[in-house]
Structure formats: C-alpha cells, structure tokens
C-alpha cells in the first residue's frame, strides 16, 4: 500500500513554494513544465503558490468560490420566519418542532439500544473465541501479544468493560499480573473506538457528511492507537502506570463503595432485556480455563434462581485430599469427604425473545448483528434527516457558535479543556464512551460540530469512561477490590497521558490532522474505510497475535523489518517535505514506486471489478440498503426512496474540485482524487423549531 | 428382612487355605459393602476388609494383605472370603457384616459368624 | 492405623445407674465413631454411629458424644438387658479399628 495515497505530486519547491509536476527538481524552473504523470493522465500541471515548508499538503489551483470541505456547511433556512407566521402557523411550527423533539429522543433512544444490543450480538458471535484470547499463557511474558488480545477481545465483545472486567477477574485470581493486564487495557481502549467508526460508516451516503463523520470517528482511533504507540514502549521500559497505581492504592485505605450510577442503562434495560439477555460470567469463565463453561451458552434462559447451599458427601481418592481431617472418613472401600456445594435451582425463566428458541448462540448473534446494525442505520439516517430540518438558519448559527466558538482571549486555550470535562461529564452519564462518540459522529457528520472541537470531547469521553471503571472498581467485593481499582487507575493514567502527549500543544494534535487526511481519501475511496476498519482492527492485531504465539524471535523476525519499512518511509516523506535538497533525484518525490505503491487509483479500479455486480444498478428496497451498496462499490447510481436516480454528487464526481485554506491539512500529503467535494444539498421548505 | 447367612465351622491346619461363604437375601445384593471382621476367643473385634458386590472393588487391611481375597457372585447373592497360610493365630469367630447407612463403615447387618480353628 | 483405646476394660454396677464408657482415638477421627453392644455368643449389634446418631430400634438411654479424638457412651440408666461388652470403632481411615471392648455386669 502506498505510504499516503497519491504521493506523486509532493514536491514542494523550497525556493519559491511552487509545485508543478512529479518530476520537477527544486534547482530546475524550467521542469515546471512537465506533465503530471501520476495519474496517467496528459493534462498539464499549473504551478500553484504552496503552504510554508513545514507543510506537505498538496493543493490544487482553486477557483474562490469553491469551500474547504472541513468548514462547516451553512445550513440554509429555507422556511417562513416566525415573525412572519400568523397564530395558527405559530401553533403548528410549535406543535412540528414538539413532534421533531420527540422523535428525535425517540430515534436517540433506540439508536442506543442497538447499539447495547449490537455489543450483545458481537458478544453472542465472538465471546467464547474472545475469552479464549485470555486463557493465552504467552500474555504474561509479551506485552504487544497482550496489547492486541485486549483490541481483538474488546472488538469482539463490542464493550470495553466487558473485557476490562474479565482482566480484573483474571487478576484477582491471580491468572494475571497486573503488568500484564496494563498493556489488554491499552489494547481495550483501542477496540472500544470502532463501535463510532462503524457508525460513521452509516453515512456513506453524502460524500461531505461521510468525509466529516469518519474523520470525527476516526480522531479517537488515531488518539489511542498513537497513545499505545508512544506509551506502550515507556511501560515496558519504565512501568510508571504499574508504579503510580500501585502507590496510590497502597496510600488509601479504601472501603467497598457503592456500584458506579447506572443512569442510561435504566432507560435502556427494559427494552433492551426484550430482546436478549446474556449470562457475561460464561466469558469470563472461559477466559479463565473454565472447562465447563466452554459448553454453556451466553445466552440467559433463567433469570430467577434460588442458590442452596449445602454439604455432600463425596468420594476422594485418599485421605490427603479431604477437605479436612476430621471431615474425612471411610465406608471400607473408598474414602470420603464433606463439599459445600451450592445448588441451583432454577425458578422463572427470562423475558426475551430467544428464550425459548434454543439456538445456538452465533445464530443468536447473526441474527441480532443484523437487526441491530439496519436500526443503528435507520435511526442514524432519521438522527441526521431530522437534525438537518432543525438545524437550519438561526438555530444552526446559535448552536455551532455555542458548540464551536472558544472563550475569548487569554483564556481561548481553556476552551478544549472545558470540552475535555463536557465529554467526562457525559460519558459519565451514559456510562459508556461508545455511545457518546457514537451520538457525536453524526453531529460531525451534519456540520454540527467541528472535528477540532470533537477532539477534546473525545478524550473527554475516554477519561469519563474510566472514572466510572473507577467507581466500579470501588464497589468491587474485598478480594477483587485493590486489582480492579488498580487496573482501573492504570486506564485512568493511560489516557491522561494520551492526552499529555496528544492534546496541549496544538503542533502535537496529530489525530486531527491523520483522522482529516483518511476522511479526504475515504470520502473519494468509499470503500477504503471498510478496509481501512478491517486492517486496523482484525488483520494487524491478528497478524500481531499468530506471529507472537509463533514465538517471539519470529515475531522480531517479521516485525523489525516492517518497522524500519514505516520509520524510512516516514523519514523520507520528512525530508521531502522539508529539506528534499539533501535526498537524492530519485528520492524526492515517489514516482519511482510503481503506481500502485502509491496511489489508491489502481485499487480502486480492483474493487470497482470486484463489486461490478452492484455498479450497473444500485436499486434497492430502502436507504440502508443502498449506503451499504454505495460504501462496496462507490456505483453512480444510487437509490433515493425506492428508486433509482442520479445521485448529484456521484454526477459530479468526475469534476476534481479544487481544496482552499491550506492550514487545515497542515503536514498532510492529500492528492486530487481525495478532495471531490460539493456543496451540501439544498433543503426543503420546512419549519424550523424556534 | 435383611439376612445373612454364613456357612459351617470350619478346622484347618496351619498352612491351609479356608473358605466363608455368606449369603445374602432381603436387599439388592449389590448395593452395600460387605465386610469381613473377625474375633478371636476372648478377644476383641479386628476388620480384616471390605468388598464392593457392585463392582468388585475389594479394600483389606494391610495385617492380612496377600493372604485374603474376598469375591462376590452376584448370581447367588454370596460374598467368599478366603484367608490362605493360616496359622494358630488365625484361630476365631469370622464374621460377615453389611452397612446399610450409606457411606459409612458403621456396620448394622451381621451374619451369625464361622468358627475357624486352626490347629495341628 | 489408628489405635482406638477403651477404658474402662470392665465395670460392674447396678441397676439404674449411669454408666460411661470412654474411647481415645490415637489421632482425629473427626465425628467418625460407631458404638456397638455384643452379649456373649451372639454377633454384635450397632447402637450408635457418628458418634451420636442411634440406629435404629435402640433404645435413648443409649448416647454418645465427643469429636476429634475423644468419645464417650453413656447408659442413662443400666438395665438388666444392658449386660454385654461394648466396642467402639472408627471409620475414619482404612482399616478400620475397634477399641478393646468394656465388659458391663451387674452388681
């Protein structure tokens, strides 16, 4: 794959700031007038006036007219104003915006509850593999085998507490250390962040929404996975979360507290426990050799069940192996001994749909994948369709300035600060960060808010998802109480250090930057973000895992030379950008890669053939249909309420629309075919609430 | 009712081999330990072992180990004991015993006893 | 094995009276102890077994106490029928082991 896609024309040319074609040299003017040969195309290229030198963004000669795709769409209100409605329409724009509010809670709440019940599903599918991710002797020794079973298990399982919880039982046990635990925890905060990738990947759709979306996605995946980056090395080196965590919980003396406020969930549960309930135990035995457990399934049948405890005699196959001494006899024959055995009988069964269905449980799973993932799309596209008619004009202005606009000077820096504590607070509310990056995609989509502005909250909501960890641990029982709080702190300290490293000096805001630069290349490659998806959340962490359990001299083997692979070609990306002078010819731009090195164009005509079965017509029963249809094939035609018709901006594709305001792709190589872009499409006349 | 029945006085000389049978009758043959304990004469009460009829699963006391063997024959409900090399010592009443209470090895069930005599 | 040690090995008394028979086991036996009552010629007979559960059919003037490595029988009140030797026996470990037996006769 190429180190950036289309990294042909990135030849800055120090002297003058110009750009012309892949071949010019900086001590060359004349060259200026070769032809761009990266795309295999004939047209010439125009010298344009580039970015400062620390810049590596490639612009292309712009008309004025045309808009950043990174700045906000101005949401035009098309509507009669209110001053200009007479009483009744007054009472009817009242009584629509009281009706828009209300679906718009309605289609938030089941938005979340598939999103509970899609975490359900990935558990009902891939549980019992995830927890045998766990029963893996290796984690102990291997910290990167322990980074990426915490990704694939927290993948799986779609909840990071769920994994975070099986680490804490793990370690209370004494099955885990708890420095083999810090890097699964690092591993879980990575696999938490797909659940708002696989969101935004609902807004395929519109090419501008889905650029913005995925890149809000995408910031926390960028965040974490660069965290684990720099932080995972100084905790093999250094163990400072092992160290501070430990001292803080040797210096309280804490007492069992109170289980972390369920406040979401006691909305959510009543209808979420219709659909299924799952027994999550049977993860955590398995995760811990649990021979039986192997066999059971998550799926909860009982849900009332009377626990008797009571001695039995059983046999032993000696008096050494009684459970005391005087508990110890025998009939002549064999010997015997007294168990505490707790008997359960069974009372009332659950109230769910596959209670009595008795399927297995990745049938269970196919089926809720399915179901959960159309409602996610179907309330996500009523989520943005219904946003969009409300925020419109006035409202739209009132809430982006709100949202958007930092405190005035000297304390503009303590805006993204007070984000960081908004996005605490509200994760802390709904007690998962899941669900608030989720809710945020598709406001980032819809141009309610700024990815710059996401970012904090985004950290925000990975601090606020460790605090309630934090008072969980708290209410752990005596045994479970000082591994749990630990691990809890370490996930804690994890993030504020991501954030230390990540968010203070606006220079190290690289998620922002990276997160812009995918969502260039994912809105004009749909299908990159899928493989983008696949890539960094199954095929790395997995390559990582069968390597790491082939031994680790195989996995330095593999795993050095692909390092120095990405370190060179950063290096050298550096030094084109900045000093190209000191590399030779050949090296100062990629043309001496072949096309498919570095450009995604090649690929894309691959997968154009792959999903030719979809690019003739696009027709389909709904909408949901059609955005997965258009993420697979990028097809010309898509459908718009059961029919078929020319999407506008897919008719535009063709025109390269040139990008403005270079400082928002600062340090990112961004080609052509990543900036198609078009003007957000015109609404209809609708009432606006307010 | 439960009953056991064991068989004949018995006189060996020393070095010989004797045989005790006990028949059962009154419970299912095969669902209780049958244990063999004998008494010498103004003696007291010495197990010798024990044998499960179910299975065949045979327990003895290490004093007697490879000079008794117990069996069981299912097919007539009767449970032998033989005890080889005898010598004068070996001179007592046996008897065959069952424990009903399941688990235990307090035996509640008692044949009438076999006098052995050992003598020359 | 375990060394199973009555006392006393004969006692006389009359009728009506209380009688205690003591057992010491050599090592903890836990509540494994059964008492059992054999008159002359006749095969013995269970009266008590984990340590102080009586068989069925005998009488309550018979009881029995004691865990670990001390027992005890007791006769609330000798009767002329009481007259015979009792055993006590563990069954705790293999082999099982009886006491030396105490010999009970009436004045």
């Known amino acids: 794959m190429a180190p950036w896609p289309e990294l042909g024309d990135a030849q800055p040319n120090p002297d003058k700031y110009l750009e012309g074609a892949a071949g010019q040299q900086p001590t060359a003017p004349d060259k200026s007038k070769e032809t761009n040969k990266t795309d295999n195309t004939e047209a010439p290229v125009t010298k344009i006036e580039l970015l400062p030198s620390y810049s590596t963004a490639t612009l292309i000669d712009e008309p004025t007219e045309v808009d950043d795709p990174w700045n906000l769409p101005t949401l035009q209100d098309s509507g009669i104003k209110w001053s200009e409605r007479d009483t009744k329409g007054k009472i009817l724009c009242f009584f629509q915006g009281i009706g828009r509010l209300i679906l718009l809670l309605g289609f938030l709440y089941f938005f979340v509850c598939s999103l509970d019940i899609l975490s359900s599903a990935f558990q009902l599918v891939g549980g019992k593999m995830a927890g045998q991710f766990f029963s893996n002797s290796s984690i102990m020794s291997n910290p990167l085998l322990g980074l990426v079973i915490g990704v694939l298990v927290t993948v799986l399982v779609q909840s990071s507490s769920t994994s975070t919880s099986i680490v804490v039982s793990m370690v209370s046990s004494s099955l885990l250390t708890v420095r083999a635990a810090i890097p699964i925890i690092m591993g879980a905060n990575i696999g938490t962040s797909i659940t708002n990738t696989i969101v935004a990947l609902m807004q395929v759709g519109d090419r501008s929404e889905f650029r913005r979306a995925f890149a809000g996605a995408t910031v926390h995946d960028f965040f974490n996975w660069l965290s684990v980056l720099v932080l995972l090395p100084v905790e093999v080196a250094t163990h400072y979360l092992e160290i501070i965590t430990q001292l803080i919980v040797e210096s309280f003396h804490f007492k069992n507290g109170e289980d972390a406020p369920d406040l979401l969930k006691v909305i959510t549960k009543p209808f979420t426990k219709l659909i299924v309930q799952l027994d999550k135990k049977v993860i955590s035995q398995i995760a811990m050799n649990d021979e039986k457990a192997k066999n059971k399934s998550l799926v909860k049948i009982w849900c009332k069940t009377f626990t008797n405890k009571t001695q039995i005699n059983v046999t032993v196959p000696s008096t050494a192996n009684c459970t005391s001494p005087s508990l110890c006899w025998t009939d002549g024959i064999q010997n015997w001994t007294m168990k505490n055995v707790t008997y359960k009988e069974n009372i009332a069964k659950c109230q769910h749909i596959f209670v009595n269905f008795h399927l297995p449980d990745l049938a269970v799973g196919t089926i809720l994948l399915i179901l959960s993932l159309l409602v996610l799309c179907g309330c996500l596209i009523m989520i943005v369709k219904i946003l969009g008619s409300v925020l419109k004009g006035q409202v739209a202005t009132v809430i982006k300035k709100t949202i958007n606009t930092d405190f005035p000077f000297p304390f503009a820096w303590l805006t993204g600060y007070l984000a960081i504590l908004v996005g605490a607070g509200m994760t802390f509310i709904v007690q998962s960060s899941s669900v608030f990056t989720s809710a945020l995609t598709p406001l980032i989509g819809i141009g309610v808010i700024t990815i710059e502005r996401a970012y904090p909250l985004t950290l925000g909501s990975n601090i606020g998802t460790t605090t309630t960890a934090i008072l969980a641990a708290l209410a752990s029982p005596g045994n479970a109480l000082r591994s749990s709080l630990q691990i809890a702190l370490c996930h804690f300290f994890f993030n504020i250090s991501g954030i230390l490293l990540w968010y203070p000096i606006p220079f190290t805001r690289l998620p922002i930057r990276m997160a812009k630069g995918l969502g260039n290349i994912s809105a004009k490659y749909r299908w990159f973000a899928v493989f983008y998806l696949i890539i960094f959340f199954f095929l790395i962490p997995l390559t990582v895992f069968g390597l790491s359990l082939a031994g680790w001299r195989v996995l330095v083997g593999v795993g050095v030379p692909v390092v120095f692979i990405i370190i060179l070609v950063l290096c050298l990306r550096l030094l084109q950008s900045r000093c190209p002078r000191v590399l030779p010819k050949k090296l100062q731009n990629w043309n001496f890669l072949p096309l498919w090195m570095r450009s995604l164009k090649p690929w894309d005509a691959v997968v154009s053939k792959f999903t030719g079965c979809f690019q003739m017509r696009c027709c389909c029963c709904c909408r949901v249909c059609c955005r997965a249809c258009c993420l697979l094939c990028d097809c010309p035609k898509c459908c718009r309420c059961s029919k078929c018709c020319e999407d506008l901006e897919e008719a535009q594709e063709g025109q390269d629309v040139p990008v403005k305001a270079p400082e928002t792709f600062d340090n990112i190589t961004i080609s052509r075919e990543a900036q198609g872009e078009v003007p957000a499409s015109d609404s209809k006349t609708e009432c606006t609430a307010l | 009712q439960v009953q056991l029945v064991q068989s004949g006085a018995e006189v060996k000389k020393p070095g010989a081999s004797v045989k005790v049978s006990c028949k059962t009758s009154?419970?299912?043959?095969?669902?209780?330990?049958m244990h063999w304990v004998r008494q010498a004469p103004g003696q007291g009460l010495e197990w010798i072992g024990a044998?499960?009829?179910?299975?065949?699963?045979?327990s003895y006391n290490q004093k007697f180990k490879g000079r008794v063997t117990m069996t069981a024959d299912t097919s007539t409900s009767t449970v032998y004991m033989e005890l080889s090399s005898l010598r004068s010592e070996d001179t007592a009443v046996y008897y065959c015993?069952?424990?009903?209470?399941?688990?235990?090895?307090?035996?509640?069930?008692w044949g009438q006893g076999t006098l052995v005599t050992v003598s020359s | 094995d375990i060394q199973m040690t009555q006392s006393p090995s004969s006692l006389s008394t009359s009728v009506g009276d209380r009688v205690t028979i003591t057992c010491k086991a050599s090592q903890d036996v836990g509540t494994a102890v059964a008492w059992y009552q054999q008159k002359p010629g006749k095969s013995p007979k269970l009266l008590i077994y984990w340590t102080s559960t009586r068989h069925t059919g005998v009488p309550s003037r018979f009881s029995g106490s004691g865990s670990g490595t001390d027992f005890t029988l007791i006769i609330s009140s000798l009767q002329p029928e009481d007259v015979a030797t009792y055993y006590c026996q563990q069954y705790s470990r293999i082999p099982l082991t009886f006491g030396g037996g105490t010999k009970v006769e009436i004045k």
């Open positions: 009154g419970y299912t043959f095969i669902t209780y330990n």
């Open positions: 015993s069952i424990s009903t209470i399941i688990t235990t090895g307090a035996v509640d069930y």
């Open positions: 044998i499960y009829p179910g299975s065949g699963d045979t």
